[in-house]
């Protein structure tokens, strides 16, 4: 009778095992083992027992011991079960960002592993088991569906294989896939709110504000603000579930025209975008041109107002005739025109908005000097010893220098309070002098003596 020890073995793939073939008869004609495995006989004294080292066991095998005794031939099989952990335990790739409320399918693939009867596949969220199934097929595939919730944000999903060889006196062998970290998000269907000037003048700065509510997680939201090809650099302020992105925008002459202002909010693998058109315009203040800013009295003066080709101007409140970007007026300069303001107002329509610009120029009229009766009376009669202020105002532009002298030497103190004496009496020659010329006027001062009773 042939016997084999051990009759059942579980061993790691590629491992070795010692198998003892024995026979009950003392002098067997033959004792050996039949196996395709590499084998070594580990010699022992005696004839009724042989020990073989079977090596590089890659798959389940059934070596057979045989013996040939006087009472006949017999055999005994040993059952070698190979175990090995899976070569691949993998979660099918998924986008890391998943919208809240979506059904997420987790798919675990397991390649290899034996014995399959002892191999289980477990899908997990953190340490919580979602599904447990035996490994079936090659590759084995286990799937489960998860309804994505807000509180799943940052959760690790993984797949674990359990090769449980504890019933065979071995251990529980576990293999775990690389974790899949779920990032959940909520991006509302409403587009972001974009507040910006509809029109913007070249070489000025404007402020753009983009905001959106109902985001999760708001800190992960990316905000892209752009005007045409110009990326803006916003300062973003976050609320619990909202943000507000504020950016300054500067425009140059190159940007003139209609530009597209974009605010895009990207969260997870979704985005919401708001577009707005901004008209960039160039509108310099109108130009007021005087033939000469400073003219002599009586000179013909042309006042012109020129503005943007599409603007409409009014000059000193008078609209251009015909209505357009140019207006002018002609005048003969009088002293009354000195310091006169000529105001040009231009109006330009940009994207339905009326933009106003003004420019003012002042005319200087050179005239005089002038001494007239109203401002410099030719006759004064004052009681002796009274307090008087001699007044004589010379007019002209530039303002003339005025001197009043009696006999060419004695001055009349113009604009000063004096006590009237006999010395003050007489005729004075008042001379007003400026770059425009000179005028004279005689002024007589009469002093009334007091009556003595």
């Amino acid at each position: 009778q042939t016997s084999v020890s051990p009759s059942k073995v579980i061993l790691p793939r590629g491992g070795s095992v010692l198998v003892t073939c024995s026979t009950s008869c003392d002098q067997p004609k033959l004792l050996g083992i039949e196996t395709p495995l590499p084998k070594k006989e580990l010699l022992l004294p005696g004839n009724n027992r042989k020990v073989y080292e079977l090596s590089n066991v890659q798959e389940d095998s059934q070596p057979m011991c045989y013996s040939n005794c006087p009472d006949g031939q017999s055999t005994a099989k040993t059952f070698l079960t190979v175990y090995w952990t899976p070569e691949r335990v993998e979660l099918a790739p998924l986008p890391s960002w998943q919208p809240v409320g979506k059904n997420l399918t987790l798919r675990c693939q397991v390649e290899g592993g034996a014995p399959r009867a002892n191999l289980t596949v477990v899908l997990l969220r953190g340490e919580k088991e979602l599904k447990r199934e035996p490994a079936v097929g090659e590759p084995a595939e286990v799937t489960t569906t998860v309804l994505v919730r807000r509180d799943h944000h940052g959760a690790n999903f993984s797949c674990r294989t359990e090769l449980d060889l504890r019933p065979q006196g071995l251990e529980l062998f576990e293999n775990t896939s690389a974790p899949y970290q779920l990032q959940t998000f909520v991006l509302p269907a409403t587009p972001p709110q974009l507040v910006s000037p509809r029109v913007l003048e070249v070489d000025t700065q404007g402020t753009v504000v983009c905001s959106l509510d109902g985001l999760f997680p708001v800190s992960e939201a990316q905000v892209h603000l752009a005007l045409g090809d110009q990326r803006l650099n916003p300062t973003v302020t976050y609320g619990n579930d909202s943000f507000s992105a504020k950016a300054s925008v500067s425009v140059t002459a190159e940007d003139e025209g209609t530009q597209r202002l974009t605010c895009a909010v990207i969260l997870g693998n979704q985005s919401q975008e708001t577009l707005q058109t901004v008209t960039i315009y160039s509108f310099p203040a109108p130009n007021v041109i005087l033939t000469k800013p400073e003219v002599s009295e009586g000179t013909e003066v042309t006042v012109k107002c020129e503005a943007h080709p599409r603007a409409k101007v009014t000059l000193n409140g008078v609209p251009a005739q015909p209505l357009g970007p140019r207006a002018q007026l002609l005048l003969k300069a009088t002293p009354e025109d000195n310091g006169r303001s000529f105001s040009c107002s231009a109006t330009l329509e940009v994207a339905g908005q009326l933009i106003h610009k003004n420019q003012t120029r002042e005319l200087r009229v050179l005239y005089g000097p002038r001494l007239d009766e109203r401002d410099c009376p030719g006759n004064w009669t004052w009681p002796e010893n009274s307090q008087q202020t001699p007044m004589c105002q010379a007019w002209g532009n530039p303002l003339p220098e005025l001197k009043c002298l009696k006999d060419g030497t004695f001055p009349l103190p113009i604009g000063e309070s004096v006590t009237v004496t006999r010395d003050l009496e007489g005729t004075y020659l008042c001379r007003a002098r400026s770059t425009q010329g000179e005028v004279t006027r005689k002024v007589t001062v009469n002093v009334l003596s007091p009556r003595y009773e």
Epitope: L18, K40, E41, L42, L43, L44, P45, V51, E53
Partner: antibody
């Protein structure tokens, strides 16, 4: 009947070389493993080296690694131990023995004396 | 390397005595332990393999036990031909190592 016979021992100077032979009969050396075990005078047993004659895989005790080489010629059913750079502490009776994990059959041993 | 320590190093006993020799490994070696008997001027002889497996032709008074790190060779009734030196040997990992030996002498 399984039999192992060693030969090649003798007196050698330190730094010298010696080649021991182990002729096997009653079995095919390719079907098992051959080891060399030594015993210094009055001392215990010390495993030296092993060969798998089927594929010439070898393993050595770190004390002799690099100095000793175990080999086999399955056509002659003989194993060898080439000993180089011999030292006084290599003085011992060298046994060739067979089996895998235990040593079931031993030769009579050959004495190697390393001395100047 | 795994160290094998035998105790006692030597013992004196009388014919018929029960003799126990122990062997301790410096780390677990499962059952990969074998016992040998050596008489002066002779090659060692295998008595027990794999801690407890008997050998054809070896008297049944020799038995082995143990697993892990502690092993025992028992001679149930010492006979005159049993006076010799006994060695244990591990084959759990390379290099294979022997105990220092236990000499059994006549009392």
């Amino acid at each position: 009947e399984v039999q192992l016979v060693e030969s090649g021992g003798g007196l050698v100077q330190p730094g010298g070389s010696l080649r021991l032979s182990c002729a096997a009969s009653g079995f095919n050396i390719k079907d098992t493993y051959i080891h060399w075990v030594r015993q210094a005078p009055g001392k215990g047993l010390e495993w030296v080296a092993r060969i798998d004659p089927a594929n010439d895989n070898t393993i050595y005790d770190p004390k002799v690694q690099g100095r000793f080489t175990i080999s086999a010629d399955d056509s002659k059913n003989t194993a060898y131990l080439q000993m180089n750079s011999l030292r006084a502490e290599d003085t011992a009776v060298y046994y060739c023995t067979t089996s895998g994990y235990w040593f079931a059959y031993w030769g009579q041993g050959t004495l190697v004396t390393v001395s100047s | 390397d795994i160290q094998m320590t035998q105790s006692p190093s030597s013992l004196s006993a009388s014919v018929g005595d029960r003799v126990t020799i122990t062997c301790r490994a410096s780390q677990s070696i499962s059952n990969n332990l074998h016992w040998y008997q050596q008489k002066p001027g002779k090659a060692p002889k295998l008595l027990i393999y794999h801690a407890s497996q008997s050998i054809s032709g070896v008297p049944s008074r020799f038995s082995g036990s143990g697993s892990g790190t502690d092993f025992t060779l028992t001679i149930s009734s010492l006979q005159p031909e049993d006076f010799a030196t006994y060695y244990c040997q591990q084959s759990n990992s390379w290099p294979y190592t022997f105990g220092q030996g236990t000499k059994v002498e006549i009392k």
